[in-house]
């Protein structure tokens, strides 16, 4: 297994609809054809998997149907979108990239993107 550099933004603010997007870029040392991308969340001394997708270079990322993640790939960049976020989901979201095929296997882990989620205030009742 070999190490690989992964870059991602330090901070992202989720939209009022609970959607956050960020780019995960990896420095591929070779011509990988099969790539696995995993989003992890670190909070309260625990790391949990948020979502994961394996894709063939040049093809779309496919997350599971019930996944809160969607994404597109372009070269060595993956554009990730996480939806359905609430204030309690604020945390450090880490991009993990694995070059699965062909060998050798490469693993890269980003420094994490701190995603801040603010629940929208309910609209006040209108007098009209």
């Amino acid at each position: 297994c070999k190490a690989m550099h992964v870059a991602q933004p330090a901070v992202v603010l989720a939209s009022s609809r609970g959607i956050a997007s960020f780019v995960c870029e990896y420095a591929s040392p070779g011509k990988a054809t099969e790539v696995r991308v995993t989003v992890l969340r670190q909070a309260d001394s625990q790391v949990t998997e948020v979502c994961a997708a394996t894709y063939m270079m040049g093809n779309e990322l496919t997350f599971l149907d019930d996944s809160i993640c969607t994404g597109t790939s372009s070269g060595n960049q993956v554009n990730l979108t996480i939806q359905g976020l609430r204030a309690m989901d604020t945390g450090l979201y880490i991009c993990k990239v694995e070059l699965m095929y062909p060998p050798p296997y490469y693993l890269g882990i980003g420094n994490g993107t701190q995603i801040y989620v603010i629940d929208p205030e309910p609209c006040p009742d209108s007098d009209f």
């Epitope: 190490a3 992890l40 670190q42 001394s45 625990q46 790391v47 450090l92 882990i109 980003g110 994490g112």
Partner: nanobody
């Protein structure tokens, strides 16, 4: 809250083997840096081995190199210390320790640890 529990200690003859286990309760050890320390009677606690959060890096004290092997099985939420060719000087209480580092350090061992287990006694004697 995560707690670490060691097991696998016991009495073994010189040249024998033991496998210590460090299991987590109340959470997972995924991406945690895990270390094994030992304390012999009347001596200071010393670090024996550690494994990085990714499992890609392992370190060993000179006194156990080539005899001890640290490994992790995330599916079992457990870290192991395989101890071969045991010597009398390996006798002591062995402690499992852990720390979840920032992701930028997941490929490294921790310099200090937040969490300690209760320890398991290893005695090497004929």
């Amino acid at each position: 809250e995560v707690q670490l529990v060691e097991s696998g200690g016991g009495l073994v003859q010189p040249g024998g083997s033991l496998r210590l286990s460090c299991a987590a309760s109340g959470g997972t050890l995924d991406y945690w840096s895990i270390g094994w320390f030992r304390q012999a009677p009347g001596k200071e606690r010393e670090e024996v081995s550690c494994i990085s959060g990714t499992g890609l890096r392992t370190n060993y004290a000179d006194s156990v190199k080539g005899r001890f092997t640290i490994s992790r099985d995330n599916s079992k939420n457990t870290v192991y210390l395989q101890m071969n060719s045991l010597r009398a000087e390996d006798t002591g209480v062995y402690y499992c320790t852990g720390k979840l580092l920032h992701p930028s350090l997941w490929s490294a061992c921790a310099n200090e640890y937040d969490l300690w287990g209760q320890g398991t006694q290893v005695t090497v004697s004929s």
